[in-house]
C-alpha cells in the first residue's frame, strides 16, 4: 500500500510552537490564542526503516508544501535542513535516509532520532526565536523533547 | 485475557463536567496506544480521542477540540477522558478501546460506559 | 474528512446463506480499512484489518476484500452468532470515520 500521512503539529517540552522563518528554516516561540495558527503543519508519513515498539520511523514533510526536513552534513557536522523535493515522488515508502527520523517515546515525550546520524536529534534551544536544529546531546541545555498534536486533514 | 472495563458515565446538564475511566488489565498498557469511542444513540460510531502510549501524542476531532481532553496513568493501568462544557450532543455510549501503535484500527474495546447530557 | 457509505443499511438473511455487506469511501483509501461487529449490547469486536486480514480468533468464514474505494465483507455461510451490526472504519487520514453501520437479522 501506499505510504500513509497524518497531519500533527509539535511542540517542545518547554510549549514553544514551531514556525516558519524564512523559506528554508524553523524556528521555536511561545504562541497563545490566535497566534497559533501561525505554527508549522507536519505531514508526517510513516516509512520503511528499522522499527520496534517505542521508535517508529516517520518523515516530516511541511503540510501542502514540497519542503521535508532532511540531516545532511556541513562542513563536517550533522544539519537539520528544509529541503524541496519533487511533489510527484514524494512522500514515498523508501524514503532516503537523510529524510528519515526515528520518532521515540519516552514516557510523556517525544524524540525524533536521526536515522542518517544515530544520536542526533531534532532540538531547540531554551531562548525564544531561535532556529530547530539538529543537536547531538540529550539532557542538556538544549530542547529534544516534544508532544505532538494530531490534527483532522 | 484482554479487559477495558469503563466508568465514570451518568446524567449531566448541559454546560457540565464528567470524568471517564478505563481500568485495563490482561496486557501491558504502557505499550499500547490507547482512544475513546463514542455511539450516540441510532448513529455511528465516533473517534473522539487519541492518545500514544506514553501521552506523548494525542488527537481530538474538531467535534470535542478544546472540550475534551485525554490522559493515562501507565502505574494504574488506566486511561481518562474529561469532558467539559458538555452539550445534548454528546450523549452517547463512551467505548475505550486499544489502538495498534501506528494509529490505526482498534483491536480490543470495552463494554462502554452511557454518558447522558440533559437538563 | 472522507465520507463512509455501507450498503445496505440492513438485510435478513438465513442460517447458511452467504451475505456480502458493501462499504464505499468518498477518497481513495488503498487497504487502509476495518470491518467490526457488533451485538447488541455488546462492545464491537475487531472481524478484518487491512481490507482482507482476518483478526486472531476470527472465523474463516468471514472474508475481506476490496481497494481504493470500494470494499466487501462477506460471510461466506451465516451462522446464528452472526446476527450483529456490522461496521467499517477507514484509518487512512484524520479522522479515522466509520460507515453508518449494517444490521444483519434473521429472516
Known amino acids: 500500500a501506499p505510504v500513509r500521512s497524518l497531519n500533527c503539529t509539535l511542540r517542545d517540552s518547554q510549549q514553544k510552537s514551531l514556525v516558519m522563518s524564512g523559506p528554508y528554516e524553523l524556528k521555536a516561540l511561545h504562541l497563545q490564542g490566535q497566534d497559533m495558527e501561525q505554527q508549522v503543519v507536519f505531514s508526517m508519513s510513516f516509512v520503511q526503516g528499522e522499527e520496534s515498539n517505542d521508535k517508529i520511523p516517520v518523515a516530516l514533510g511541511l503540510k501542502e508544501k514540497n519542503l521535508y526536513l532532511s540531516c545532511v552534513l556541513k562542513d563536517d557536522k550533522p544539519t537539520l535542513q528544509l529541503e524541496s523535493v519533487d511533489p510527484k515522488n514524494y512522500p514515498k515508502k523508501k524514503m532516503e535516509k537523510r529524510f528519515v527520523f526515528n520518532k521515540i517515546e519516552i514516557n510523556n515525550k517525544l524524540e525524533f532520532e536521526s536515522a542518517q546520524f544515530p544520536n542526533w536529534y531534532i532540538s531547540t534551544s531554551q531562548a525564544e526565536n531561535m532556529p530547530v536544529f539538529l543537536g547531538g546531546t540529550k539532557g542538556g541545555q538544549d530542547i529534544t523533547d516534544f508532544t505532538m498534536q494530531f490534527v483532522s486533514s | 485475557e484482554v479487559q477495558l472495563v469503563e466508568s465514570g458515565g451518568g446524567l449531566v446538564q448541559p454546560g457540565g463536567s464528567l470524568r471517564l475511566s478505563c481500568a485495563a488489565s490482561g496486557f501491558d498498557f504502557s505499550r499500547y496506544d490507547m482512544s475513546w469511542v463514542r455511539q450516540a444513540p441510532g448513529k455511528r460510531l465516533e473517534w473522539v480521542a487519541y492518545?500514544?502510549?506514553?501521552?506523548?501524542?494525542?488527537y481530538f476531532p474538531d467535534t470535542v477540540k478544546g472540550r475534551f481532553t485525554i490522559s493515562r496513568d501507565n502505574a494504574k493501568n488506566t486511561l481518562y477522558l474529561q469532558m467539559n462544557s458538555l452539550r445534548a450532543e454528546d450523549t452517547a455510549m463512551y467505548y475505550c478501546?486499544?489502538?495498534?501503535?501506528?494509529?490505526?484500527?482498534?483491536?480490543?474495546w470495552g463494554q462502554g460506559t452511557l454518558v447522558t447530557v440533559s437538563s | 474528512d472522507i465520507q463512509m457509505t455501507q450498503s445496505p443499511s440492513s438485510l435478513s438473511a438465513s442460517v447458511g446463506d452467504r451475505v456480502t455487506i458493501t462499504c464505499r469511501t468518498s477518497?481513495?483509501?488503498?487497504?487502509?480499512l476495518t470491518w467490526y461487529q457488533q451485538k447488541p449490547g455488546k462492545a464491537p469486536q475487531l472481524l478484518i484489518y487491512?481490507?482482507?486480514t482476518l483478526a486472531d480468533g476470527v472465523p474463516s468464514r468471514f472474508s475481506g476484500s476490496g481497494s481504493g474505494t470500494q470494499f466487501t465483507l462477506t460471510i461466506s455461510s451465516l451462522q446464528p452468532e452472526d446476527f450483529a451490526n456490522y461496521y467499517c472504519q477507514h484509518f487512512w487520514s484524520l479522522p479515522f470515520t466509520f460507515g453508518q453501520g449494517t444490521k444483519v437479522e434473521i429472516k
Open positions: 477518497g481513495n483509501i488503498h487497504n487502509y
Open positions: 487491512n481490507a482482507k
Open positions: 478501546a486499544r489502538q495498534n501503535k501506528k494509529l490505526t484500527w482498534f483491536d480490543y
Open positions: 492518545i500514544s502510549s506514553g501521552g506523548g501524542s494525542t
